[in-house]
């Protein structure tokens, strides 16, 4: 029976050219995490295997860094990085848990404009 829950950073925004940390946290279960896959739509970005370590897709190795923890750091963001990201936890004996994060990459001026009019 799957009792765990995935907490994520939810919907986040970042500036073009900047970096962002994608984080998921599995709680409320004692299941062993075997592997975490990070995917963007249907593309596998990175794998963190408890025994076999971190592996980054060759398509993203220049812009993706492992961690912190089981999270993923995206660097040199472009507008094309906007979209859904998924953390897929392979756990034993529970099964597979999936968390979703939506990232919006904004032009610098847009991000600054948005910040200027934030409600305190």
């Amino acid at each position: 029976m799957m009792t765990g829950t995935i907490e994520t950073t939810g919907n986040i925004s970042a500036e073009k050219g900047g970096s962002i940390i994608l984080q998921c946290h599995l709680s409320s279960t004692t299941a062993q995490v075997t592997q975490v896959n990070w995917e963007q739509q249907d593309q596998l970005l990175a794998i963190c295997n408890a025994d076999l370590g971190w592996h980054i897709s060759p398509s993203f190795k220049d812009r993706v860094a492992p961690g912190p923890g089981l999270g993923l750091t995206l660097q040199s963001l472009t507008v094309n990085d906007t979209g859904e990201y998924f953390c897929i936890y392979h756990t034993y004996p529970d099964g597979t848990y999936t968390g979703r994060i939506f990232l919006e990459v904004l032009e610098s001026s847009v991000a600054e404009h948005g910040a200027r009019f934030q409600i305190p």
Epitope: T34, Q35, L44, I47, N49, A50, D51, L52, G53, H55, I56, S57, P58, K61, I88, H90, T91, Y92, P93, D94, G95, T96
Partner: nanobody
Amino acid sequence: EVQLVESGGGLVQAGGSLRLSCAASGRTFSNNVMGWFRQAPGKEREFVAAISWGGASTNYADSVKGRFTISADNAKNTVYLQMNSLKPEDTAVYYCAAGPKTPDTRNYWGQGTQVTVSS
């Protein structure tokens, strides 16, 4: 059912070379992680090397860097461990491992192959 079958172990003199193979059946691992561990008598199993994306990403234990090379042949669904400049302390049973694929959620392990390096 996924099976990992290791081969290539044996007895070799210090300074010699061996190439281990790990053939995976029942599942394709081209987009996943595979690797090698070893366990010497009376010691815990330790990580040796790992590979993914058909060789684009590799990790090595410090103790084997520069001596061992991990590679993969996706067409044959096989991972290799080329071991050069072998030392007596490399003597161990070498195990192949592969990451999980949905719906399975545990790593897969082979039965192991013995490598003995004599001085």
